[in-house]
């Protein structure tokens, strides 16, 4: 979390960001609150991102004013202009770019002052791992396949069973390159499985940790997957 | 209210160029950008172009060589040129407008400019 | 280029009927998928923006789903005005494209 604070002749106000992630090709949110004011054409919003020229997005006397908006957020952002009136001057990054990566100042005016905060926004790719039997191999296998990520994530198997073992030598971990050229389809093969035991894969980078577990029975398979994103940090 | 209003020639000689203005109103051309969608008689729509608040635009890659979008925001008018028409260009020409200001829709149209490419 | 495949390309149907009418994209374009409806001589109408959102004044009977590639527009009660033509598009990637369209006739 930042929280920033004017430092001007007039009052300084609150400004507070949280640094996130972005998920390329899909949709953003950078975060960031303010002190609320009454009258919404009192409200200027800007953000800015550092190294770029022109404005990321500025929204001012109600409406957006984009007329020195940079090259590269053409019709990508947008503010919740529902919202403003209420503190929340967080802005909504469509299409999500490896390049949209950097930090970001939220800069806002009121009547009742100016305040800022910087944002870090990683960009990259996670997704969810799906882990099932692989009734194609010669012995019992598990296959963990998870669709998209970037950068090269690390692969970890575990099991409920045998904590603390190291299952390097019996797992076989692929990375394919997807058709955009940038993520890659993550593949891990865990062989030599045995029965009532609980497997997880650990699929992880510096973006995001995500995790499948099946657990395998004689009489049932139970899945259940989760992802976490690191570093999410308020300012 | 938001209106956008397409006035151009009518009629184009082959070989010749088309220019084309849309006038807004009830909304600035530096909160929004602006369409060009084209429809063939009798036929779908095809994107053809935006400019961008800032001013910066981009084109339909089928259209780069002979389109050039320009805008006015003080008149509030965006101008549409074509070049070197044929007779597959005879189309109704629309501009319109996005619902928010990252493209999700095209909310607002013009009424259309039939544009026959006939000598 | 994304390619928008509307299906079906024509539909007849009665008044009160229940029509769905899908749009598949070649490649994914996440929820950033409109829907239009055109009648002869007329400029296109937005009905639905962003998958689901329906646009304002259009009639709750209309309404979007779909993520990814696969988009449909429901008219959950159909009425004589909506004999039209209906358009899916795509606003995720350059070039912005739509579908070939789907005319709703009346059975």
């Known amino acids: 979390l930042i929280i920033g604070f004017g430092i001007s002749g007039r009052h300084s106000i609150t400004v507070t960001t949280v640094a996130s992630a972005g998920n390329i090709g899909e949709d953003g949110i950078l975060s960031c609150t303010f002190e609320p004011d009454i009258k919404l054409s009192d409200i200027v919003i800007q953000w800015l991102k550092e190294g770029v020229l022109g404005l990321v997005h500025e929204f001012k006397e109600g409406k957006d004013e984009l007329s020195e908006q940079d090259e590269m957020f053409r019709g990508r952002t947008a503010v919740f202009a529902d919202q403003v009136i209420v503190g929340n001057a967080s802005l909504r990054l469509k299409n999500v770019q490896l390049t949209d990566a950097g930090t970001y100042k939220c800069y806002i005016i009121t009547s009742k002052g100016k305040g800022n905060a910087n944002l870090e926004y990683k960009t990259g790719a996670f997704s969810m791992p799906e882990v099932n039997v692989d009734y194609n191999a010669s012995s019992e296998t598990l296959r963990c396949e998870a669709p998209r990520w970037f950068p090269q994530p690390t692969v970890v198997w575990a099991s409920q069973v045998d904590q603390g073992a190291n299952f390097s030598e019996v797992s076989n971990t692929s990375f394919e390159l997807n058709s955009e050229n940038v993520t890659m389809k993550v593949v891990s093969v865990l062989y030599n499985v045995t029965i009532n035991n609980t497997y997880s894969c650990m699929i992880e980078n510096d973006i995001a940790k995500a995790t499948g577990d099946i657990k395998v029975t004689e009489s049932e398979i139970k899945r259940r997957s989760h992802l976490q994103l690191l570093n999410s940090k308020a300012s | 209210q938001v209106q956008l209003v397409e006035s151009g020639p009518g009629v184009v000689q082959p070989g010749r160029s088309l220019r084309l203005s849309c006038a807004v109103s009830?909304?600035?051309?530096?909160?929004?950008?602006v369409q060009w969608v084209r429809q063939a008689p009798g036929k779908g729509l095809e994107w053809l172009a935006v400019?961008?608040?800032?001013?910066?635009?981009d084109y339909n890659a089928a259209f780069l060589s002979r389109l050039t979008i320009s805008k006015d925001n003080s008149k509030s008018t965006v101008y549409f040129q074509m070049n070197s028409l044929r007779a597959e260009d005879t189309a109704v020409y629309y501009c319109?407008?996005?619902?928010?200001?990252?493209?999700?829709?095209?909310?607002?149209w013009g009424q259309g400019t039939l544009v026959t490419v006939s000598s | 280029d994304i390619q928008m495949t509307q299906s079906p390309s024509s539909l007849s149907a009665s008044v009160g009927d229940r029509v769905t009418i899908t749009c598949k994209a070649s490649?994914?374009?996440?929820?950033?998928v409109s829907w239009y409806q055109q009648k002869p001589g007329k400029a296109p109408k937005l009905l639905i923006y962003g998958a689901s959102n329906r646009y304002t004044g259009v009639p709750s009977r209309f309404s979007g789903s779909g993520s990814g590639t696969d988009f449909t527009l429901t008219i959950s009660s159909l009425q004589p005005e909506d004999f039209a033509t209906y358009y899916c598009g795509q606003t995720y990637s350059y070039p912005f494209t739509f579908g070939q369209g789907t005319k709703l006739e009346i059975k």
């Open positions: 319109a407008r996005d619902v928010t200001t990252i493209v999700e829709g095209f909310a607002h």
């Open positions: 009830g909304f600035s051309l530096t909160s929004y950008g």
């Open positions: 490649e994914k374009v996440g929820t950033y």
């Open positions: 400019i961008w608040s800032s001013g910066s635009t």
